[in-house]
Structures are given as C-alpha cells and as structure tokens.
C-alpha cells in the first residue's frame, strides 16, 4: 500500500498554522466561463487571467473577457480589463507571453465582422499598461515572436500572407502571399511553405520550402515538392515528394536549407506520416508511421548528422497524424524517454530507455505494489504508466507524467501494475531515480506538482466532488500530510504553479456554485514557512545516476561518462531556494562497442555487439545508396552515438570502405545508377 | 573479496598532523564512497567524513570541519585521511570503511568493510 | 546533526535470551539505519543495513525493524558469539552513531 500519514509522517511541525497565514483566498466577480492564466517573465510573480463569458444570442453570440493581474505569486489579482478597453478577447489565441524575461504580452481582439483587419493589445512591461493597435490583416495564428529577439514577431493571416513586424506589433508587413506555414529558426531567420496553384491542402506535396534570414527583403527557395517541414534541435527535416510515386521521404539539413541529404528512412505512403518525437543538438527521434491504419509504427533515433537511423523501438504506439503518443522525455535524468508499444494482443505496454533510445525495457514493478488480478503471473508484471493517449481516451488520469530538470531523478506519474496498462482506476508512482525503481505514492488519481525544485510535491485527490483538501510531502513522496485550505469545499478545475518548479507558490483554482451563479476562485499556497530555513552543505548527499551495479567499473556510465548529483535529503526540510542551481560533476568512462552504432551498411546481429557489414542492400537502404551524398557512402562502419563522450577504451578501427559499388542492382534500369550522386 | 589494508601506528606532538593511508583490493574502489570513524579509548564511534573516489567528493562531520582533510588516489586504489592541528583528545584507533551501496546514493546503506585500524597517539 | 539515541547503554543476557535493543533518532530518518556488532580490539561489523535487511553472511537471528525514528535490532536467541558492544548508525544525514549497547554474559 502507499506510505500512510501516521506519527512517522509527521515531519512538518505546526504546519496548519503556518499554511493557514500564507492563504490567500480570491473570488472573482464574473460568471463562470472559461479561464486561462500566464505567467509572464521569470521569478516576478506576475500572473495573467483571462476570463471569458460567452452567451449565445439567436444571430450571434455575445461574449465578455475579463483580465485580471497578480503580481505576487496570485495572491492578490487587480482587475485591469479597463487596460484593455473591456474588448473581448479571443481565447483560441490565447495570450502570447515573450520569451525569456521580455515582458511582452499580446492579447488578440475580437472585431465586428466588417473590419479591415484585426486588433491587438500589446505590454513590454510585464501587463503594467497595454498599447491598442488596429492590424492590416485577420490573424489566423497567435503571434509569433522571434527566440533571438522578441521585437520580432510574425502572424499569418486568415487570406494565408505572411505578415512579419520588427517593433513589436506596432507596424506591420505582409512579406509573402500563399504561405501554408511559418516557423522561426535561430538568428532570426523565417521558414515557410508556399502554395502556387490553389491552396495549402491542394498543393500538399507541391510546396515550395522558402527561407528569409533578413525579415523579408530577400528570399532563398531551398526546397520544392514539399509536403511538410519541421525543426528540431540544430535540424531542418522536410518530407519530399518522391518523383516516381506518392510516397515522400525524409530530407535533413544542418545548414538551414543550403544542403540537404535524404535520410536513411522508409519513405512513407499518403495515409501514413513522420512526427519528430523529440529533438536536440545532437540527435533525434523519429516516429515513422506503419501502412495501414494499425496505430503503431517504429521509432528510430539518429546519428550526429540526422542521416543515418538506427531502429530502436517497433510497435511505437501513435495514433493517426497528429494523433496521441504517449512518448514523454523524462526531463529529470539525461537519457530517459518513456513511451507505450502496441502489443500483438492490442494491449499497450509501457517501455523505458535509459540510454537515448538504445535499448528499451519495461518499468520494475514497484516493491510496494502488487500486480493487477489480470496478471498472468502474480510475481512478475511491470509498471505501466498513463499519458496522454490514456488521457484521449477519457481514462481516470487528470495528468499527464512530470518531471522536471532541477528536481533531478524525479519522476511522477498514473499507473497501473500488471501486464499491460490497466483501464481501472489509476494510482499515483513516483521514481526517485529517473525510472529505475518506483514506489506507489497516492492511492487513486490525482492532480500534483513539484516545488522547490523537489523540496515539496503538492497534490490534490481527483474528485467529482467538492474538494477543500491539499496534500504536500517534503521527502519525495514518501510521507504525506493534507492541510483544509478552506472550510467550503470547491469545484477543483486545476493546480497553477510557475513554470519552472522553483516557486513555494501553488495556486488552487476551481468554482464555487450557488443557487444562482457560479464564480471562479482560486487560493494561493505559500509554503515559504514550512520551509523555515535555507538548505545547507549538510542537507544535500551525493548520488550517482543510472547506477546498476557497484561492482562494474563503469556503473553509471550513459552515453560515455556517469555523472554524480548533489541530492536533497529526504529528511531535509529545508528551501532550496529559488536560485538554486542542480551540482553535478561529471566524469568520463572508456569506450566500448556500446558508445557506437552502426554506420550505412552495417547492422548489429542479435546479441552483438559488432558491426557488421550487410551482405545486400534492399528497400530504403538501396534508396538511400542510389540517392545520397557520395560522402555519406564512405565509412568504417561505426559512428559514435550522439552525445557520447567516451574516450580511450575501446576504438572500432577498422578500413574505410566505398560501399558505392553495392549501389547496383538488376531491378534499377541503367539511367538510375547513373544518378546515384546528388 | 574486498580488503581494506591500513597504515601503521603512529605517534605524534600535539599540533602535529597525521596522514593515515587506507589502500583497497579486490574490488571497484572506484565506485564506492570510503568513510573514516574513530575511537578513542573506551568510546563510541565517531565518523569524521568520506570521500567518493571518482570526482573526489569529500564531505566532512561539523566536528571536524577545517581540521580534516579526506583524499583518494584513483590509480592506486587509496584513500588518505590526514588531521591537523593534533591534541590529546585525538589519541584513537581511525578505522576506513567502504560505504555499501545498492543504489546510487552512497552513505545510506551501512559500512560493510572495515580497515583493521590505526592507533594515532597524541602526546607531548 | 542529528543524534541518536541508543538503550539500555549496557544488558545483561544469557544464553538463549531473546535480546532486543532500540536506537532513537531526534528527526525521521526514514529507514536509513544501519546496526554494527563491535567485538574489543576489532572493527566493527555491519550486521544490518536500511532499518530491516540482513548484510549477507550474518545470522537470521539477527533482525532489525522500524522507521521514522523508532528502531529495534533484535537477537532472537542469543548465542555465545553475540556478546558484544552493538551500535545503530543513521545515515540521512550526516553519519551519525548512537552510543553503543553492551551486551554482556549475566
């Protein structure tokens, strides 16, 4: 069973008085509609809330917009709707906050139907004062504003222009017509997709891939039969059109579009698709789609260059394009990705990697858990963890798994023990490891959330009723203690703490419901005095991440070096404070065959470790051979995994081979191996 | 099976230092945090610090902040203990232990192999 | 620091007796305790680790329980070779021992 709260528990002292003086009740004197909340800047406490009303009156609907400004934490919320001349705003464009600690905000306006164009509000001073500005367009996207600079933003428009302005939304320029997508790339530069004939779905396949890198004076065409385009960490993946069919591969650049290399990946068919699941500077994760409509498909993780693939996960559950995958980067521990495969009995079964997609097995069971009644075996099941397809298809699950980069090695999520994910209720687990072990931490499903870097998780029970209870720990789960935060219970509609998980703040958000109205109110949490005092050299202890075994030289070695953590205790309780940084000393291993994957024309055999060459190359790898660079076609045979940063050891010498002349074949007529360069 | 071997007796002035040496074999000293604990003449232990080999972690008991200084050596498979400013009430015997370990944390489980000991006499 | 607090400082037993000695610690500890067996002139001995499991090659009369603050190591029939000083060491926070049980021969 789950830890208790008894005498054991009881960590935190008087703690009722403490929380009591740090609640901060506010009702807000509007109808119940919907709400979204921002948080604007970093650390400064500054929180947005949009309320909107709608009434649906015979020809139109009616709609009211309140926006309201905390700037302590939501403790305390002004009406500022007069800032914005009580217009109503549009909630599909939600409130478009700058990056980093700019302080800009947009807000899009709803305007009557006969206007020339749109209307936005916009703050560069944290939503102190907003300025009015009538558009030349109808926007169709939220403003877009630049990573590098946020005077920069860009829209698209409802007639698909791409409308670009370099003083914040003051002033703005349609710089290209029949543009179907737009992203920023870094320095500023602009990415899109345009159409020639008659639109976006028409042309899918025929679009031109265009780049600008000065705001729209000049434009580079760096790509054509195009059906889509992505970025992902320092790649440009576009998926092309194949010349003699209607299936489309994979393209990479590294160069924003200067050069392009195909990728060494199936092409796909008109019903299936691509999706980047994760991304960085080093590699990717690409989910490439099964034929048919199975659900499923495989996952394969690149090399350094995005070129070479190797396959790392099959049966990858994802659910049509733009579908659910429960595919999660377990943000606490370097390396970690947790995701769901379809099994032949069309159960889905969690699977975790540990070493960037190298190898995936399934969750330890948790020590203090017992398999489900459908277990085949009662002794030997796993943990299998709810995300969002669970959520899609309306499960008992109010969240998705969290883990956060300066709580490190935590990891909290809804599961279920057994053979496969269960459709009972939920509980909740938490991993203190980065998905090593776990241990059920709640019974049934609730809302949570980590402060202080992991100093405190907060939770709140998921319920149809009125709720009027919080639960927090400050031992990573182990013991909990529940705190009344007020005597009428509320309808509960969600959990607000700023991003980031450095804030002591959490925010209560829910309705209260009378006879005759319903009103939204939230109360704000600090914990700041449940944790007296700073935390000190004495309350950290050191830890090694992905440790297995002791006794192997290299234990806690990932991708060519082990690092070692300062922790916080559990008993600990104490504030790590909102500067606090994670301490972590790295250290590098020694190379083995491990630290590298097989280059073109190479492949593992089952349980070796050595590459070896393939006698034959067929389907996407002939492709490739036929149709990529020349220099992608010379190698030893091993590529050192992205991110590895092994040294001595182990060093896979071996001769460089051509493998161009395997680029022959009877089936390919002679005009094709003449262009087998590109 | 892991040894810990220790160095010799020693006696020393008060305001002295002394640098016990603890040398491991048999295993991956690498891996494992390595603990000092004295006793002085018919008391209890007492754990001065540790240190993790890889990366030189040491960390240190308030007592002893300041005066103790806990170091390894990764290619000799030693780590050293040395006290400084020396006073009678440091006479003990000063055992090593490797710190057990089944997780990634390296104090929590126990120490489960013991050094055979180093008398350090203090006197004038 | 934390402290802990060992009792009684000295039991005497005899053979055959069912020993049990409790280690108090001032804050939870979770269960990251440990119990040593010492015999004079020797190093001390790790007889259980994490409040309740057996280091491999110590005898299943030896068992230990608890969590939070309270612990117990218990000797469920004391032999010959159990009379001995026996200590509790936390390890949550900095290391810390309790004072140290004699059990001697009554």
């Known amino acids: 069973s789950a830890p208790g709260e008894d005498e054991e528990c009881g960590r935190v002292r008087d703690f009722v008085a403490k929380l009591a003086n740090n609640t901060h009740q506010h009702v807000f004197d509007d109808l119940r509609g919907s709400v979204s909340l921002s948080w604007v800047g970093d650390s400064t406490g500054v929180i947005l809330v949009l309320t909107t009303f709608h009434v649906p009156l015979v020809i139109m609907t009616f709609g009211q917009s309140k926006l309201y400004r905390s700037e302590d934490y939501g403790k305390n919320f002004k009406d500022i709707t007069d800032l914005i001349n009580n217009t109503f705003i549009r909630t599909e464009f939600g409130m478009a906050i700058g990056p980093e600690n700019s302080g800009k905000v947009v807000l899009t306006a709803e305007v009557s139907g006969g206007s020339r164009g749109g209307r936005i509000f916009r703050s560069s001073d944290f939503a102190k004062n907003f300025v009015q500005t009538d558009l030349p367009f109808h926007p169709l996207t939220q403003m877009m504003y630049s990573p590098q600079n946020s005077d920069y933003l860009l829209a698209l428009s409802t007639e698909n222009g791409l409308w670009v302005s370099k003083n914040f939304g003051g002033k703005w320029e349609e710089i290209h017509k029949a543009v179907c997508l737009a992203k920023w790339g870094s320095d500023n530069t602009i990415f899109f997709t345009t159409y020639a004939n008659g639109s976006c779905k028409a042309d899918l396949g025929a679009l031109e891939l265009w780049r600008t890198s000065d705001l729209g004076k000049s434009f580079k065409t760096i790509g054509v039969k195009i059906y889509s385009f992505g970025l992902g960490g320092r790649f440009l993946f576009a998926s092309v059109m194949a010349d003699k069919d209607t299936t489309r591969r994979i393209h990479v650049s590294t160069d924003q579009g200067d050069t392009w290399s195909m990728a060494q990946l199936p092409s796909v068919g008109q019903e299936q698709f691509y999706s980047i699941l994760a991304a960085n500077d080093d590699m990717v994760f690409m989910h490439v789609d099964e034929p048919g409509d199975t659900g499923f498909g495989t996952i394969f993780t690149s090399d350094d260059r995005g070129i070479v693939y190797s396959k790392s996960l099959d049966r990858h559950l994802y659910t049509t394009t733009g579908g659910e995958t429960d595919f999660t980067n377990v943000t606490s521990l370097r390396g970690v990705y947790i995701t769901s495969v379809l099994s032949e009995d069309n159960s889905i079964q969690t699977m975790i990697t540990f070493d960037q997609g190298g190898r995936w097995t399934h969750l330890r069971k948790p020590e203090n858990s017992e398999c489900d009644a459908a277990a085949k075996n009662k002794n030997e099941c796993s943990l299998h963890i709810h995300a969002s397809y669970s959520i899609s298809q309306k499960l008992n699950v109010p969240m998705a798994p969290l883990s956060e980069p300066n709580a490190v090695g935590i990891v909290i999520a809804h599961g279920s023990v057994g053979d496969a994910i269960s459709v009972m209720v939920p509980d909740v687990y938490i991993s203190d490891d980065g998905g090593y072990s776990w241990t059920k931490m709640l019974e049934g499903p609730h809302y949570y959330t980590i402060l202080d870097s992991g100093g405190i998780i907060v939770a709140i029970e998921h319920s149809s009723r009125p709720i009027n209870v919080i639960k927090f720990s400050t031992d990573e789960g182990q013991c909990w203690q529940t705190y009344t935060f007020t005597r009428d219970p509320i309808y509960f509609t969600g959990l607000a703490s700023e991003p980031g998980a450095r804030s002591m703040n959490i925010s209560i958000w829910g309705f209260t419901e009378s006879f005759l109205t319903s009103q939204w109110v939230s109360y704000t949490i600090d914990f700041k005095d449940i944790l007296e005092r700073n935390c000190e050299e004495k309350d950290y202890t050191i830890w090694l991440a992905h440790s297995t075994d002791p006794e192997d030289y290299e234990d806690g070695c990932i991708l060519g070096y082990k690092e070692q953590f300062l922790r916080l205790r559990k008993s600990s309780v104490c504030q790590n404070g909102r500067d606090y940084v994670v301490t972590k000393q790295p250290s590098i291993c020694l190379c083995s065959l491990e630290d590298f994957l097989c280059d073109f024309g190479y492949y593992r055999p089952e349980n070796d470790s050595k590459c070896v060459e393939q006698p034959e190359l067929k389907g996407h790898d002939l492709e490739f051979c036929l149709y990529g660079r020349e220099e992608h076609l010379t190698t030893n045979g091993y590529r050192k995994i992205p991110g590895d940063k092994c040294q001595g050891g182990v060093n896979p010498v071996r001769e460089v081979k051509d493998l161009k002349k395997k680029c022959t074949s009877n089936f390919l007529s002679p005009e094709k191996q003449n262009s087998k360069s590109n | 099976q892991v040894q810990l071997v220790q160095s010799g007796a020693e006696v020393k002035k008060p305001g002295s230092s002394v640098k016990v040496s603890c040398k491991a074999s048999?295993?991956?000293?690498?891996?494992?945090?390595i603990s000092w604990v004295r006793q002085a003449p018919g008391q209890g232990l007492e754990w001065m610090g540790g240190?993790?080999?890889?990366?030189?972690?040491?960390n240190y008991a308030q007592k002893f902040q300041g005066r103790v200084t806990i170091t390894a050596d990764e290619s000799t498979s030693t780590a050293y203990m040395e006290l400084s400013s020396l006073r009678s009430e440091d006479t003990a015997v000063y055992y090593c232990?490797?710190?057990?370990?089944?997780?990634?944390?390296?104090?929590?489980?126990?120490?489960?192999?013991w050094g055979q000991g180093t008398t350090v006499t203090v006197s004038s | 620091d934390i402290q802990m607090t060992q009792s009684p400082s000295t039991l005497s037993a005899s053979v055959g007796d069912r020993v049990t000695i409790t280690c108090r610690a001032s804050?939870?500890?979770?269960?990251?305790l440990a119990w040593y067996q010492q015999k004079p002139g020797k190093a001390p001995k790790l007889l259980i680790y994490k409040a309740s499991s057996l280091e491999s090659g110590v005898p299943s009369r030896f068992s230990g329980s608890g969590s939070g603050t309270e612990f117990t190591l218990t000797i469920s029939s004391l032999q010959p070779d159990d009379f001995a000083t026996y200590y509790c060491?936390?390890?949550?926070?900095?290391?810390?021992f309790g004072g140290g049980t004699k059990v001697e021969i009554k």
């Open positions: 240190i993790i080999p890889i990366g030189g972690w040491a």
């Open positions: 232990a490797r710190q057990g370990r089944k997780t990634g944390y390296y104090y929590y489980y126990g120490m489960d192999v």
């Open positions: 804050q939870s500890i979770s269960s990251w």
């Open positions: 048999g295993g991956t000293f690498r891996n494992y945090a």
């Open positions: 060491q936390q390890a949550d926070g900095h290391i810390t």
